[in-house]
């Protein structure tokens, strides 16, 4: 019997300082470019080696970005989201959602990483 895959969703505020070559990550998503089924949110698709985000270390590929400097990213066209990041200034505050995959064992058994016991 196979284990069930669950997800642990957490949110975090990440403050980045724009580096010499910018923030150092790519995004996908938007109302006109849904990358995740039934979700027009903005997701991190790539983190540039040695860029500002990589050096900070907290932002991960696959993270959903909920807001930039307090501005909600819901229902934005992809290019509008890109422009928002490019014009966000030197100090950029990101509200992000991390989605961590958790593998549970078969029913009636404890999976690896089960905090109980």
């Amino acid at each position: 019997m196979n284990g069930r895959v669950d997800y642990l969703v957490t949110e975090e505020e990440i403050n980045l300082t724009r580096g010499p070559s910018g923030l150092g990550f790519n995004i996908v998503g938007g109302t006109d470019q849904q990358y995740v089924s039934n979700d027009s949110g903005i997701y991190v698709s790539r983190i540039k080696e040695n860029g500002a985000a990589a050096l900070d270390g907290r932002l991960q590929e696959g993270d959903k970005i909920l807001s930039v400097n307090g501005q909600d990213l819901k229902n934005l066209l992809h290019q509008d989201a890109v422009d928002l990041f490019r014009n966000a200034g030197y100090a950029v505050s990101l509200r992000v959602q991390h989605r961590l995959q958790v593998q549970n064992g078969p029913i009636g058994h404890r999976g690896e990483g089960d905090p109980s016991g």
């Epitope: 910018g22 923030l23 150092g24 790519n26 470019q33 990358y35 698709s45 790539r46 992809h78 490019r86």
Partner: nanobody
Framework: EVQLVESGGGLVQAGGSLRLSCAAS????????MGWFHQAPGKEREFVAE????????GYSDSVKGRFTISRDNAKNTVYLQMNSLKLEDTAVYYC?????????????????????WGQGTQVTVS
């Protein structure tokens, strides 16, 4: 994973034109930023132009602005580089490149580190 195949290179006289094409595999082509780089003999690979997934945003190196035009046809999974007013110094191998998503940084700083997938290149010689 994306495979890229360039075509359209060749020998052309100074002042002439060429159009390079880059055919890409993959189902989500419109989610990829596409770029062109060139590499002259004995030199590093340098950014030429890039285009966003929807085609609405483009960027060019100063050396080709006003002469080269990048475009894409997402229905055909193809990106193009129209090269006009070619100069001797445009002689190089031209590489197509792709990266998932749109960079949140302007195209002023593009380097090979900004792209993950590369074609084999096509030779352009201006005489």
């Amino acid at each position: 994973e994306v495979q890229l195949v360039e075509s359209g290179g060749g020998l052309v006289q100074a002042g002439g034109s060429l159009r390079l094409s880059c055919a890409a595999s993959g189902r989500t082509f419109s989610s990829y930023t596409m770029g062109w780089f060139h590499q002259a003999p004995g030199k590093e690979r340098e950014f030429v132009a890039e285009i966003s997934g929807t085609g609405g945003n483009t960027g060019y190196s100063d050396s080709v602005k006003g002469r080269f035009t990048i475009s894409r046809d997402n229905a055909k999974n193809t990106v193009y580089l129209q090269m006009n007013s070619l100069k001797l110094e445009d002689t190089a191998v031209y590489y197509c490149a792709a990266v998932l998503g749109s960079p949140t940084d302007s195209s002023d700083y593009r380097s090979t580190l900004d792209y993950d997938y590369w074609g084999q290149g096509t030779q352009v010689t201006v005489s």
